[in-house]
Interface confidence: low
Amino acid sequence: EVEKTACPSGKKAREIDESLIFYKKWELEACVDAALLATQMDRVNAIPFTYEQLDVLKHKLDELYPQGYPESVIQHLGYLFLKMSPEDIRKWNVTSLETLKALLEVNKGHEMSPQVATLIDRFVKGRGQLDKDTLDTLTAFYPGYLCSLSPEELSSVPPSSIWAVRPQDLDTCDPRQLDVLYPKARLAFQNMNGSEYFVKIQSFLGGAPTEDLKALSQQNVSMDLATFMKLRTDAVLPLTVAEVQKLLGPHVEGLKAEERHRPVRDWILRQRQDDLDTLGLGLQG
């Protein structure tokens, strides 16, 4: 809390400019009008204020807007955003994607902070769903964003947004998340032809049921072992040796290296030894 003191004669700020960097903290508090600051927030980032001075500016905005800043101010916060707490941000109502982008830009290159997490949370809740433009923006700044969402929150992702998802965006997703995303991806890509469809759906297959894997095995897709190892064990177990051979194509030889790991291990134990022998890989059921 900065003590209230009268502004010295001739020091009253008429605009937000570089002269303010020479003001002491108490002078900023006394001489800068909060409403002026709010209307000229876009200038603050061009001025090399100290962290202590930024604290004073934040304090002035907090006093002017105790219920939370309006979006016109939020959009121009710039580096002052880094001074905000999650509790401050929870008071905001951010609806513009441009505002979101401006604030994410400030934090670019850093880990996702609790402040940014709260900002995104507020934005997505305000929109009601993760539309394609939002998802595009968020995954551009934070590739792991999708896998940070709970299955329940992922259910608000419309299938049309799935087109914005890149394979690396799903790297850290677990089975429960892929269970939600896979049906959406299947719907989104349903009109593509076989080989193009497989390229798009591949990253989501950790949520695929047995019947879909059986269907894929009829399409000469040549699934790689890395994708196969991420499949649901319960979806892989009912597949026959012939189906797995068709599904993997030339990659079937990789089963030997993975024979001790799930889902390969559990699948091997479900097969007849005669069938396994047809692969010529020395797999023991």
Partner: nanobody, 124 residues
């Protein structure tokens, strides 16, 4: 409903380490364990650490940064608090909290379910 069970508390000497764990059961698809708070005798409950759904986003109280680490299991139903370089002022009852939403947060109002707590005493 979500039930939370903390464990791992105890008596430890200054400079020592402890790992607390909190296992959740019940409706953990929506509400999952994601934070630790603590309450020392005669003081208010205070935030210690929080972790987001994906496990990569974390938040810590300044007083524990660099000493405590919050983590979670792959299945998302257990959250841990690894406490190193413990000090006498870390003595408190430690509570696990579960909430909805994916962001880590220090705001106790964001949590819907709380455990019974586990006592941590740091003393020589």
């Amino acid at each position: 409903q979500v039930q939370l069970q903390e464990s791992g508390g105890g008596l430890v000497q200054p400079g020592g380490s402890l790992t607390l764990s909190c296992e959740a059961s019940g409706h953990t698809d929506s509400y999952y364990p994601k934070a630790w708070f603590r309450q020392a005798p005669g003081k208010e409950r205070e935030f210690v650490a929080s972790i987001g759904w994906g496990g990569r986003m974390t938040a810590y109280a300044d007083s524990v940064k660099g000493r405590f680490t919050v983590s979670r299991t792959y299945a998302k139903n257990t959250v841990y608090l690894q406490m190193n370089s413990l000090k006498p002022e870390d003595t408190a009852v430690y509570y696990c909290a579960a909430g909805i939403g994916w962001a880590p947060t220090a705001d106790s109002g964001e949590y819907d379910y709380w455990g019974q707590g586990t006592q941590v005493t740091v003393s020589s």
